[in-house]
């Protein structure tokens, strides 16, 4: 049997529930080796991917996904997924971003932690080679 | 098109081990599906037995078939349904089934036509 | 271990009527929820995921929705062609539980 790869977690700093206008970051995190990140919106179709990934801990690597400036489009569900060649993970459970009215200054401390980590679906059907992740954005809409 | 299609189902008596295999076209396991074999009997209704995702190895067994039943993947386009010890109870129409490609929240979208395993001495 | 409790067993509704199914899930599972209809012989045809969004090609008059740990399937203005066999499902394979229990299923006949 095939080892398992452990699910990958997501979190939105400063929260999940953002202002219009300001600045949101996904961390997404997993297993050291991680050569690929993947944030999808919704379903697999909407993603962006990274190689820039951080080693967060000795255990644990990571990468970050920034909107600078949220608007009331960026709503929505947001999951992580990696790839750790040759294999890509299942994927995190959704967290949901939530963009209110700006009732302060891009700073203003009004917004709610949050973080998931759990199964859901796959990466979008880019590359047939199993050694090598989809390439970003051959069939999907781009995130920001 | 894809496509799922079954195969191994036959009579056999109990206490007998039996493998069904569940042949996959026109997609990758590369991508990491959620595969899962689920159960009828006759006349009954759907009953889930597990699921294992095509890339990264993961299985999910229902409490039940743990022990007694083993979902592995065989090749990229292969995953089999090992079943050991077998009563009348296990007697069913036997599918294979694949998450959605388009969809969140893992709905089993693809389904192959069965293969039927009947217990009986 | 998660149960899924599908009521009712079966309903009986004229043509151009409305059934409602409800599925109790024994635990939360977070909308991973699926419902999918199978005629008799036939493969199952997924209907709705994520508890209320539409599979493609599915007609508008079936609609699924949440109250807490309680899915709703809403039939409306039924045809002959809706006479079959209705199943919920949690699709939540995770750590968290094990998901994937169907609900006993319902059938449904047209009168």
């Known amino acids: 049997q095939e080892e398992d790869l452990p699910r990958p977690s997501i979190s939105a700093e400063p929260g999940t529930v953002i202002p219009l206008g300001s600045h949101v970051t996904f961390v997404c995190r997993g297993p050291v080796g991680v050569q690929t990140f993947r944030l999808e919106r919704d379903s697999r179709s909407t993603y962006n991917d990274t190689e820039d990934v951080s080693q967060a801990s000795p255990s644990e690597s990571e990468a970050r996904f920034r909107i600078d400036s949220v608007r009331e489009g960026n709503a929505g569900l947001y999951r992580c997924i990696y790839y750790k060649p040759p294999k890509w993970s299942e994927q995190s459970d959704y967290l949901e971003l939530l963009v209110k009215e700006s009732s302060g200054g891009p700073d203003s401390p009004d917004t709610e932690p949050g973080s998931s980590a759990g199964p859901t679906q796959r990466p979008s059907d880019n590359s047939h080679n199993e050694h090598a992740p989809a390439s970003q954005g051959l069939k999907a809409e781009h995130l920001y | 098109e894809q496509s799922l299609e079954e195969s191994g189902g036959d009579l056999v008596k109990p206490g007998a081990s039996l493998t069904l295999a569940c042949t996959a076209s026109?997609?990758?396991?590369?991508?990491?599906?959620?595969m899962c074999w689920v159960r009828q009997a006759p006349g009954k209704g759907l009953e889930w037995i597990g699921c294992?995702?095509?890339?990264?190895?993961?299985i999910y067994y229902a409490s039940w078939a743990k022990g007694r039943f083993t979902i592995s993947k065989t090749s990229s386009t292969m995953v089999t349904l090992q079943m050991s010890s077998l009563t009348a109870a296990d007697t069913a129409t036997y599918f294979c089934?694949?998450?959605?490609?388009?969809?969140?929240?893992?709905?089993?979208?693809?389904w192959g036509p069965g293969t039927l395993v009947t217990i009986s001495s | 271990e998660l149960v899924m409790t599908q009521t009712p067993a079966s309903v009986s509704e004229a043509v151009g009527g409305t059934v409602t199914i409800k599925c109790q899930a024994s635990q939360t599972i977070s909308n991973y929820l699926a419902w999918y209809q199978q005629k008799p012989g036939q493969r199952p045809k997924l209907l709705i995921y994520a508890a209320s969004s539409l599979a493609s090609g599915v007609s508008s008059r079936f609609r699924g929705s949440r109250s807490g740990t309680e899915y709703t399937l809403t039939i409306t203005d039924l045809e002959c062609d809706d006479a079959a066999t209705y199943y919920c499902?949690?699709?939540?394979?995770?750590?968290?539980?094990?998901?994937?229990?169907f609900g006993g299923g319902t059938e449904v006949e047209i009168k």
């Open positions: 294992i995702h095509s890339s990264s190895g993961s």
């Open positions: 499902q949690c699709t939540y394979y995770g750590t968290t539980y094990i998901g994937g229990a």
């Open positions: 026109g997609f990758s396991f590369s991508d990491g599906y959620y």
């Open positions: 089934a694949r998450d959605s490609e388009s969809y969140g929240y893992n709905p089993c979208e693809l």
